[in-house]
């Protein structure tokens, strides 16, 4: 059996070397001479020769200083043989523990640590954490037991101890009130890490703390009184620019200004914020009326996009806005005038009077009337009174100029102000119908096939309105009934069916068709009928010799 006591060896020993560690014994040495040897890391494998053993005595020796931070434990095997070289013992594992010396100082993980904290943060607010490491043994010794301290703070304002550091964790916290970004936006701390619980080796690093902005400063008007002027009736006109200062961080919601007009119930003004310089741009939201009010005194308040973090006074400004008088156009009353008149209204008679009012009550002005648009040239106006008369016959069925029985004319009124101003009124003449149109057929050109012809539907059109329209009466005249027949196609008699009585020669025919409306107004229309060399339904076919009264006349 082996006799091996526990083995430990301090690192960094002085010498002289080799130095005895322990004597190894085998019980077999009573039976004869025993020879000792060792194998393993530090003996016969790298690092080779750190440990040796005296062959005959069994003394285990170290040959050089050890470094725990490089190798903390060596595992060797001891061997015992007799003089003839036979093993007298099984190999035995030997553990050599290198004991620690405080030969490493702490090291910070960064040279500079960065953190941030909101201004106004209360004591106890965590800011950041610094971390250091130590290579020494932190299990069996205090050689790696690090303690953190703050060595200095720059600036030392408003207090030299604004922050504290947890000795054990390295967490930096606020310890004193009074952090103010606008006064001291950054702090630089020199922090120390020392082993042996602060009594041993030490090192330093820098912690840079940025104080972040909160909305603890209001925007303030400078100046607080303004003057501006604006012409009446004009919207979106810039009146003046309002100036503010805000100590908070530029181009942040805590700096950006929001303007509110406190006494603009009518919503006549608006203040927008210039995003570049935070100015307030006061403009008209709608046209102002000089005749109604000549001056406005506005009270404008300014706040930020985000609420104030602390109780702050809201800054206000006073703006005096003078409204400038402008010559305004006369206004027709009503702007659109509807007048009902029969389409057979007498030429030269007065239809209506259409006048305008002068908005410029502070000026004595004369109004002159003119017709601006009268596409059919039916009207004339008295320039002084606005009386409108007919100069030509009206026609409800003039569909180029009349839409839905309504003729639209534009009348203008011009004052004698400086500069001259002109207003426009719309005159709607609602033309009532008279029975001045006889019915007409549509189409007037018809095609039939000579063989197996398909009857053709002819629509009856009357430009008038009921009761001057359907039911219509149709009749073939001038001998057309010899070759052709008609019958009504629908109960309202608004269309007829035309067909030949017998086979007709290919060629062109003229059929006289008399159409009469419900009020007995009639008209004879000539239908142009072509009989084509085809069967069934006719397309368009070539023109042949004309035929009078539905009877073909030889050439």
């Amino acid at each position: 059996d082996w006799v091996i006591p526990p083995i430990s060896c301090p690192e960094n020993e002085k010498g002289p070397f080799p130095k005895n560690l322990v004597q190894i014994k085998s019980n077999k040495d009573k039976e004869g001479k025993v020879f000792y040897s060792i194998t393993g890391q530090g003996a016969d494998t790298p690092p080779v020769g750190v440990f040796i053993i005296e062959r005959e005595t069994g003394w285990l020796k170290v040959t050089e200083p050890l470094d725990r931070e490089r190798i903390a434990t060596y595992t060797l095997f001891s061997h015992a043989v007799s003089s003839n070289g036979n093993a007298v013992e099984d190999p035995m594992e030997i553990l050599i523990t290198v004991t620690d010396q405080n030969d490493n100082k702490p090291e910070f993980t960064q040279e500079v640590f960065k953190g941030s904290v909101m201004e106004g943060a209360l004591p106890g607010t965590s800011v950041m954490e610094v971390t250091a490491t130590d290579a020494d043994d932190d299990v069996n010794t205090y050689n790696a037991a690090i303690a953190y301290t703050i060595l200095s703070q720059d600036p030392e304002l408003p207090d030299k101890n604004m922050f504290t550091i947890n000795r054990n964790t390295g967490v930096i916290s606020v310890v004193t009130t009074g952090l103010d970004r606008e006064s001291f936006p950054t702090y630089t701390l020199v922090v120390q890490a020392a082993d042996l619980q602060g009594e041993g080796l030490s090192t330093t690093a820098t912690a840079v703390i940025t104080v972040t902005d909160t909305n603890d400063n209001p925007p303030i008007f400078n100046p607080t009184t303004y003057k501006g002027q604006v012409p009446e009736n004009e919207a979106n006109v810039v009146i003046t620019t309002l100036k503010v200062t805000d100590a908070d961080a530029p181009n942040t919601p805590a700096w950006e200004a929001v303007y509110t007009i406190l006494n603009d119930d009518g919503g006549q003004f608006v203040v927008t914020t210039n995003p570049v310089n935070n100015d307030g741009i006061l403009k008209t939201a709608k046209g102002l009326d000089f005749e109604a009010k000549q001056q406005y005194i506005l009270h404008v308040a300014v706040t930020n996009v985000v609420p104030f973090e602390v109780s702050l006074t809201t800054s206000t400004a006073t703006v005096t806005v003078d409204v400038l008088d402008v010559n305004e156009a006369p206004i027709f009353v009503p702007p659109e005038k509807r007048v009902e008149v029969s389409e057979d209204f007498g030429v030269g008679q007065e239809i209506t009077s259409y006048t305008a009012q002068e908005p410029d009550t502070f000026m004595e002005q004369k109004i002159t009337y003119r017709i601006w648009r009268d596409t059919a040239n039916w009207l004339e106006i008295n320039p002084d009174t606005g009386a409108i008369s007919t100069r030509a016959e009206l026609d409800r069925e003039d569909f180029e100029h009349v839409k839905n029985s309504t003729y639209t004319a534009l009348i203008i009124a011009t004052d004698n102000g400086s500069p001259v101003a002109t207003g426009t009124g719309t005159l709607l003449l609602i033309l009532s119908d008279v029975n001045d149109n006889a019915p007409i057929p549509e189409p007037r050109t018809i095609f039939f096939c000579e063989r197996n012809p398909k009857p053709q539907v002819i629509n009856i059109i009357d430009a008038d309105l009921p009761p001057n329209t359907s039911p219509f009466t149709a009749e073939l005249t001038h001998g057309a009934s010899a070759n052709w027949t008609i019958q009504y196609n629908d109960p309202t008699q608004e269309s007829i069916i035309l067909k030949p009585k017998m086979a007709l020669e290919v060629g062109d025919y003229k059929i006289n068709l008399k159409l009469m409306d419900n009020q007995n107004k009639d008209q004879v229309t000539t239908l142009e009928v072509s009989v084509c060399d085809c069967e069934g339904a006719a397309g368009v076919c070539r023109k042949a010799q004309p035929v009078e009264a539905g009877l073909q006349i030889p050439a």
């Epitope: 096939c449 000579e450 063989r451 197996n452 012809p453 030949p500 017998m502 086979a503 007709l504 020669e505 060399d533 085809c534 069967e535 069934g536 339904a537």
Partner: antibody
């Protein structure tokens, strides 16, 4: 009932002429066209032309305009077809026909046919 | 002029069979009219305006088509249907007839 009665068969010499008749009955003779159709032996039908008893107008198939002359005798309600300058090619059965209506493009009523044989 | 081509030239069928004969026009026509002609007799109007049966024609006959393609169909052929059938157009002058289809009953 509408009837078209044609004249009997004819055997004629080449170069001569023949006149075929078609007597209409059972309707107003002037109200409808009379058409003439040729059918060569074992062959199809060919339209020769038509005559309008209403206005004495004729319409011919270009192929037969120098071969046939169409006439009518309104007093006897009879239609005639003269065939001239006969050759063996003219040997055929010739039919007169009319439509149900004056403007029909098809032929509802047919005569019994007249066989014309051209032979030396 | 419009040329009408009929096919087949001869059509042979047993009683009760369904048969169809066609008529093709060299250009589009509005209608086709059909005639039946038995040996030694005049033609008889059979179908007019493409699909209308003439008076007395059995309902087993029908006509259809448009443009340039038309047909006559006999649903269940009978011995009395043996004849030559001609198609005819008059969409343009002169009216023309097809060459005929001879229907034989076995």
């Amino acid at each position: 009932e509408v009837q078209l009665q044609q004249s009997g068969p004819d055997l004629v010499k080449p170069g001569t002429s023949v006149k075929i008749s078609c007597k209409a009955s059972g309707y107003s003779f002037t109200a409808c066209y009379i058409h003439w159709v040729k059918q060569s032996h074992g062959k199809s039908l060919e339209w020769i032309g038509r005559f309008s008893p209403n206005n004495d107008r004729t319409t011919y198939n270009q192929k037969f305009k120098d071969k046939a002359i169409l006439t009518v005798d309104k007093s006897s309600s009879t239609a005639y077809m003269d065939l001239r300058s006969l050759t063996s090619e003219d040997s055929a059965v010739y039919y007169c026909a009319r439509g149900e209506e004056s403007w029909d493009a098809w032929f509802t009523y047919w005569g019994q046919g007249t066989l014309v044989t051209v032979s030396a | 002029q419009i040329v009408l081509s009929q096919s087949p030239a001869i059509l042979s069928a047993s009683p009760g069979e369904k048969v169809t004969m066609t008529c093709r026009a060299s250009s589009s026509v509005s209608y086709i009219h059909w005639y039946q002609q038995k040996a030694g007799s005049s033609p008889t109007s059979w179908i007019y305006a493409t699909s209308n049966l003439a008076s007395g024609v059995p309902t087993r006959f029908s006509g259809s088509g448009s443009g340039t393609s038309y047909s006559l169909t006999v649903n269940r052929v009978e011995a009395e249907d043996a004849a030559t059938y001609y198609c005819q157009q008059w969409s343009t002058t002169p009216p023309t007839f097809g060459g005929g289809t001879r229907l034989e009953i076995k």
